[in-house]
């Protein structure tokens, strides 16, 4: 599996989605677990509805939620007001019994909020890692615009 | 009508080469996964491993791995069966099952092939 | 792996008597991964129990199956002649698939 690599701003929301072929894992829950290190193993962050039928209401953890859209096929994951703490690498999974199937690894980056001004020396930025060379990034860099804000920087 | 329908039987020698079929009718071939089991004469219920024809995607059973190969043609709705280097022990009916997709259930076989008798001896 | 033991290995009884079956697993199961099959002489294996509990399509409602954990149990309430076969159970839920050795039930 490459990593898909999904950026946000921290305190706002970051959705990662993870598309799977939906008859392959029809019937199957499924999952979004952290990795524990490279090796290490994947601790089981939120999972969707017990009955499978009902996997499209929205399932919380703390700040974590996970829903599947069954038919067509896209798990998907919020992290709301994320956190440098946040950032790490990540599995969405297809569960069967006691055995899962890794539908997407995810690296999550916590970018600061450009309009906060506090030190952002803590905030974990990924340095250049071998196992994420081939990592597909998506941008998904999303906050809500405030009032009378332009939404880009005038051209000159 | 749903169904599975596999080649007729074979008798080989051991050494020899085989590969079996079992061909899909009646439903959409590359939306289920198919496994296959083999039952030794006068014997139980052995599951192989799977394979999901939509892309390939195969599991086998440790006691098989690397004993047989579990292929598909989904252009042909036709998962495959075979041995390099068949043994006397390879003496047996092989059947071959669709996973059920029932929700919250995938993975009972609902529907069989007749299945294919392979007798190696010398 | 699961290891799932059939007893008792043959059962013998009239038609219209009651079977039970009993299959044990190893490991806990959910019971949405245990199935229920039967077999006679030359014929492919036929779902008729799927989650523990559930009748596959076609299936009269003499067979039933119960039981959760580590116990599963299929019920026959009135034997038929055409009933009399080999059962074997099955579990899915952790890989590999693995099946009972089998009840062979015969008629008395």
């Known amino acids: 599996h490459n990593t898909t690599v999904f950026q946000g701003v921290a305190g706002q929301s970051l959705q990662v989605s993870c598309p799977y072929d939906s008859m392959k894992h029809w019937g199957r829950r499924k999952a979004w677990c952290r990795q524990l290190g490279e090796k290490g193993p994947c601790q089981r962050v939120v999972s969707t509805h017990n009955l499978w039928l009902l996997s499209f209401l929205r399932r919380w953890n703390g700040s974590t939620a996970i829903t599947d859209d069954t038919l067509g096929g896209t798990l998907t994951i919020t992290l709301r007001n994320l956190q440098p703490h946040d950032a790490g690498l990540y599995q969405c999974q297809s569960l069967h019994g006691s055995e899962a199937d890794t539908l997407r690894k995810v690296l999550v980056e916590v970018l600061a909020d450009p309009l906060d001004h506090r030190d952002a020396g803590d905030l974990w930025f990924p340095g250049e890692s071998e196992s994420f060379e081939d990592a597909h990034v998506e941008h998904s860099i999303s906050r809500s615009l405030l009032e009378g804000e332009i939404p880009f920087p005038p051209t000159s | 009508e749903v169904q599975l329908v596999q080649s007729g039987a074979e008798v080989k020698k051991p050494g020899e080469s085989l590969k079996i079929s079992c061909k899909g009718s009646g439903y959409s071939f590359t939306s289920y996964w198919i496994g296959w089991v083999r039952q030794m004469p006068g014997k139980g219920l052995e599951w192989m491993g799977i394979?999901?024809?939509?892309?390939?995607?195969?599991r086998y059973s440790p006691s098989f791995q690397g004993q047989v190969t579990i292929s598909a043609d989904k252009s042909i709705s036709t998962a495959y069966l075979q041995w390099s280097t068949l043994k006397a022990s390879d003496t047996a009916i092989y059947y071959c099952?669709?996973?059920?997709?029932?929700?919250?259930?995938?993975?009972?076989?609902?529907?069989w092939g007749q299945g294919t008798m392979v007798t190696v001896s010398s | 792996e699961f290891v799932l033991t059939q007893s008792p290995g043959t059962l013998s009884l009239s038609p219209g008597e009651r079977a039970t079956l009993s299959c044990r697993a190893s490991?806990?199961?959910?019971?949405?991964?245990l199935a229920w099959y039967q077999q006679k002489p030359g014929q492919a294996p036929r779902l008729l129990i799927y989650?523990?509990?559930s009748r596959a399509t076609g299936i009269p409602d003499r067979f039933s199956g119960s039981g959760s954990g580590t116990d599963f149990t299929l019920t026959i309430s009135r034997l038929e002649p055409e009933d009399f076969a080999v059962y074997y159970c099955q579990q899915f839920d952790s890989s590999p698939i693995t099946f009972g050795r089998g009840t062979r039930l015969d008629i008395k």
């Open positions: 394979i999901y024809p939509g892309d390939s995607d195969t």
């Open positions: 490991q806990i199961i959910s019971s949405n991964y």
């Open positions: 989650s523990a509990s």
């Open positions: 099952a669709r996973h059920d997709i029932i929700p919250a259930a995938p993975g009972a076989f609902d529907i």
